[in-house]
């Protein structure tokens, strides 16, 4: 994963100043107090496409 200063983090990840790294938001379930989890909470969810018109 790239450093947050290099490029924006990819979808589903957020920048950790502490680690100088984009971190997977999925890890916030195990470590909810990590600094990057704030960015995960603020990020919009992945687009959801309805299965009917």
């Amino acid at each position: 994963e790239q450093a947050p200063g290099t490029a924006p983090c990819s979808r589903g990840s957020s920048a950790s100043a502490d680690l100088d790294k984009c971190m997977d938001c999925a890890s916030c379930r195990a470590r909810p107090h990590s600094d990057f989890c704030l960015g995960c909470a603020a990020a919009p969810p992945a687009p959801f496409r309805l299965l009917w018109p």
Epitope: E1, A3, S16, A17, D18, L19, D20, K21, M23, D24, S27, A30, R31, P32, H33, S34, D35, L38
Partner: antibody, heavy 123, light 111 residues
Framework: QVSLKESGPGILQPSQTLSLTCSFS??????????VSWIRQPSGKGLEWLAH???????RYNPSLKSRLTISKDTSRNQVFLKITSVDTADTATYYC???????????????WGQGTSVTVSS | DIVLTQSPASLAVSLGQRATISCRAS??????????MHWYQQKPGQPPKLLIK???NLESGVPARFSGSGSGTDFILNIHPVEEEDAATYYC?????????FGGGTKLEIK
Amino acid sequence: QVSLKESGPGILQPSQTLSLTCSFSGFSLSTSGMGVSWIRQPSGKGLEWLAHIYWDDDKRYNPSLKSRLTISKDTSRNQVFLKITSVDTADTATYYCARRGPDYYGYYPMDYWGQGTSVTVSS
Amino acid sequence: DIVLTQSPASLAVSLGQRATISCRASKSVSTSSYSYMHWYQQKPGQPPKLLIKYTSNLESGVPARFSGSGSGTDFILNIHPVEEEDAATYYCQHSRELPWTFGGGTKLEIK
């Protein structure tokens, strides 16, 4: 029980390449969030962070030394390596490796350290 | 680089009294939610030992007489009451951005 141990050449001459090994146990460098840093301390002086390697092989270096540093790892053997090229007497120091790992509250600073290995650069 | 300046460089404190060590950063090491400052203790011939992480969180096994406070650029390590075994050099360290840097150290002597 987490432990780390550094090893190195002890003495080397100016312009040579310093190769250091950090052998650790009690944690895995394949665990998400885990990382190992190298830090050095000249005798009687302060601490200087050199480099860090992450579980996914991502690497970070101190910009003041970046051109001379290479950090790498062998996850299966629980080892982290640091090479410093073109050493000078100013590189004489005790070299430490230290772990940064995840916990419930986020990520530790350097919570476990090795005892250090003394390196002298002398002609 | 963020420069961490510790003061005093050394101090002598009587047994049972309070020791206060300051660490000032050249720029803020805090965000609205986090302060990325940590404290270590180092005794001669030993590696540093983590005491306090993220300004005020005591590392497991560290006595409650150690406490940390501060935000932004100004941080404090307090030891009260000081015990004989606290004689050591204390370092602050930040992880706000790279490179991670340490303060110059404060040597604590017990009178």
